[in-house]
Structures are given as C-alpha cells and as structure tokens.
C-alpha cells in the first residue's frame, strides 16, 4: 500500500488508517538527532545562515567514521594530489565544501527540511509526466561506486515534464543512505529523516550541455523519493541492489541490464513538494528544481541493510551516512501539489507564489 508523508501531521497513526492506506507512525516532535538543522523563528523569517554541521556530526557520531579534513588532505593512502586545487571532498568535512566550490556557501542550498505546516498548496502543480523510463534489458547501463554514492548512468531518451514547456531528460540516478541503525535521507519532513533517498537527476532540454545548465534557474531538475522499510522485497530495487557486491570497491564500474526506472519511483506522481535549491554535493550549483514525492518507496529491511553495508569509500571506510545536513530556507517557500499543511483550507494558499522553472 502506498504510504504518504502527510500522515505525519497531527496525531501519529499506527498501522492501517481507516482508508486502508498506511500512514507513517512518526512523532511530530523530531528526535534531537533528526531535528531540522535550522529552526525557523516564529515570525516565519529564516534565521541568518548558521552552519550546524558541528552539531550534526556530533549527534551522528561522524567523528568516529570520517574525520573532517581539508579537501587537499583527504586522499588518505590513495596517492598524491598535486596542484593547489581543492578537489577532494567528503561528508565528514562539509564545512570545507565552500573551499571546493564557493556555491556550497550559497543562500539557496539543498537539501531542506520540509515543514508541512509551512508548505504552500499550489493548484498549478500538475502530475509529472515520465516518458521512456521503462528501459529494456539491452542496452546495458553503467552502475558505479564513485566513492560518494552508487550511480546508475541513464541513456538518452528518458523524458520528463515538470509542466507545459518544461521538458527535461534524465542523466543519472543515485542514492543516499545511512547505516543499519541510523537513517540517511537527505531531505527531512517535519524533522524526520527516512532510511534512504533516491535522486533522479535531469537536464533541461533548453540546454545541450550539462555545464551550460549548472547554476541556471531550472537548468537541472531532480526527482526525489524517500525509501522506507516494509515487509516485502522491492523487485525493481533488487535489480540494482543485487549488483552492489560487484562494485563494493571505490571506483568500480559494471554494466547491468536496463530496467524500469519509473518502478524505482513512487506510483503516485501527482502529490509532491516543489522548491528551488541546489545540487547536494559539490559544486552545489543552485537553480535546481526539486520535486520530492509525498509517497514513499518501500524496500525490505534486508534490502535497506544491503544498501547500507555493501559499498566501500575512501580510506577503506564503509560508504555510509552519505547525506548532507539540511540547509536553511532563507525565505524560500516549499510548494505542495496537494494540501499538505495541517491547517490547510479548501482554498489554495499562496497560489501566486507558484514559480515556473526558469523564472
């Protein structure tokens, strides 16, 4: 059964709701470790940008896993990095990301905490349209461990429309996760962090080149969905997870049969959150249109465990907790394609706040 995020508002429900649709049994008050990285003051204004990465690393115990370090010293035993360029980055040293790319210190960064009561219902946000995502086994696709995530490179022909005249083509997809006992999604909802998150990265058809689009409003669009535990195995994800052992080493790349990419996303493409942010890793380019689906994707406990323990990253450390702390909204509004706010009225709120990719 599809599970939605909006069930987290009000009283948490357990098991099946009266509608027969599972709702998330999530405490409204988040635990300390999953608290929003930037608590907004009551007047609705975002605070000055304060990086709470130290607090985040303390609460996650990251000091035991990957010590923050300057990018130029982060290669460990992997050989020399000559030249003065700051090119290495790690999740243990996100405070140093602006040295790698100044855009990482920008005001409109991702990920963010989606606070349901502050979302603006926007009727103009239509269901997404995906075309050509059901790939055949041939040609095969590249699956790689780049030291930061597992990435599936997608072939030409996967088309997506955010709305009329806003067409994109899929470039790649990748995942973010935690450990067996700590969730690792990038976005959070009311401070709640999910076990994992999938990102499908798209390039606007207005640009022929990725680097033309970087930093341009609407140049890139990412579809994001939360992965959540359920009793049943997800057969679509098994087509990826079954190959992780083959790319356990950092830098590994293999070819796997093509698969139905749409099956990796929720079935309900009509209920989602929308905001403008950035890439969540260096170069942290802004102008990225984010679509975060309300419905979660279900994986078995074994599958989530496989995701979190199969890959290795730099310096012979497990590739885990590969998520960036949530970033301040700094005045941005998160729009919802459905009335997600707890006190939402039948009338659309902030209907004029709806933006169009490229505005």
């Amino acid at each position: 059964q599809p599970q939605g995020l909006s069930g987290m508002q009000g009283e948490p429900s357990l098991g099946d709701s009266s509608s027969g649709e599972d709702e998330l049994g999530v405490d409204v008050l988040p635990s300390e470790e999953d608290a929003p990285e930037e608590a907004d003051p009551p007047d609705g204004e975002d605070p000055p940008e304060v990086n709470s990465e130290d607090r985040m690393e303390e609460s996650l115990g990251l000091e035991d896993l990957s010590t923050p370090e300057a990018p130029e010293h982060s290669q460990g035993s992997h050989g020399d990095e000559k030249g003065g360029g700051h090119s290495h980055w790690s999740y243990g040293g996100t405070l140093l990301w602006p040295q790698v790319s100044p855009a990482c210190a920008g005001r409109f960064q991702s990920p963010v905490d989606i606070r349901l009561e502050r979302t603006a219902f926007c009727r103009t946000l239509q269901p997404l349209e995906l075309l050509g995502y059901e790939l055949q086994p041939l040609p095969e696709l590249s699956l790689s461990n780049n030291g930061h995530t597992v990435q599936l490179t997608l072939p030409p022909g996967l088309k997506m429309a955010l709305g009329p005249g806003q067409e994109y083509r899929a470039l790649q997809l990748h995942l973010h996760w935690g450990t067996s006992d700590h969730p690792g999604s990038e976005h959070t909802v009311n401070g709640h962090r999910f076990p994992a998150e999938i990102h499908v990265v798209h390039l606007s058809t207005a640009f022929s080149e990725l680097h033309e689009a970087l930093g341009r409003p609407g140049g890139l669009a990412v579809l994001a969905a939360f992965l959540q535990e359920s009793p049943e195995e997800n057969s679509a994800y098994e087509q990826l997870l079954s190959h992780l052992e083959e790319i356990s080493e950092e830098g590994s790349k293999i070819e796997i049969p093509g698969l139905d990419v749409s099956a990796l996303l929720p079935s309900d493409l009509s209920r989602y959150y929308r905001y403008e942010g950035s890439l969540t890793t260096p170069p942290c380019s802004q102008g990225v249109i984010w679509t975060v689906f309300n419905e979660t994707v279900k994986l078995s406990a074994k599958q989530l465990h496989t995701l979190s323990v199969s890959l290795w990253g730099p310096r012979d450390s497990r590739l885990q907790l590969n998520f960036r702390a949530t970033q301040p909204l700094n005045g941005r509004t998160i729009e919802a394609s459905f009335p997600a706010a707890e006190d939402s009225s039948p009338e659309p709120v902030h209907v004029n706040s709806c933006f169009t990719a490229g505005d």
Partner: nanobody
C-alpha cells in the same frame, strides 16, 4: 562545450614508459574536481576496457592487467588527469580514451599507443 583531449600517445618499445595526459576545456566548472575520471583502452577487434579510475576522493582503481605498472593521477590546478605507463608490453597497444563521469559522461577522441620493437 566540455571537451576532453588526450595526448602523449605514440610508438614505444617494450619495457618502455609513456605518459598520457587528458585535458578538459570549455567548461565553466572544473570538471575534474567533481568527476570520477577514467582511462579506457580499445585494441583492434576488442571491446573497450577500463584501465584505471581516479575518484573525487582521490581513490584509484586499476584493471588487473595494468596493476603495478600504470599510475593514474589528477592535477586539478591544471585541469588534467595523467596516466603514467611503465613496463609497457605489446598487449598494451590500443587507442586510449579519457572519460569523465559527472552527471553525464564525457569522452575524448582517443590517442594511439603502440608498443612494438
């Protein structure tokens, strides 16, 4: 437009050395700072083969056939990735291609390396 350009190929005797260079041009962002960069090779009548990879963390990986003889490194300041090839063998003869993988794949045109006496 991002362009990758390989250089350094040529004729070399068995047991000799050669250094290949891959330079990126035309991009607003230093692609080698954010991309996993690999060298591939393709011998006549054979499939393209992954030779060496360097990730953005500085991690390196080599195919079994070149381990201990080839070294991949990155010079982000000069926006180049190097492949130092030592103890070359006739079976290393191939066209060598540079590949940068950041959100999308970028390929160079290739440079021919011939190992022959």
């Amino acid at each position: 437009q991002v362009q990758l350009q390989e250089s350094g190929g040529g004729l070399v005797q068995p047991g000799g050395s050669r250094r290949l260079s891959c330079a990126a041009s035309g991009n607003s962002v230093n692609i080698f700072s954010f991309a996993a960069v690999a060298w591939y090779r393709q011998a006549p009548g054979k499939q393209r083969e992954l030779v060496a990879v360097i990730t953005t963390t500085g991690g390196t990986k080599y195919s079994d056939s070149v381990k201990g003889r080839f070294t991949i490194s990155r010079d982000s300041a000069k926006n180049t990735v190097l492949l130092q090839m030592n103890s070359l063998k006739p079976e290393d003869t191939a066209v060598y291609y540079c590949n940068a993988d950041y959100l999308q794949d970028y390929w160079g045109q290739g440079t021919q390396v011939t190992v022959s006496s």
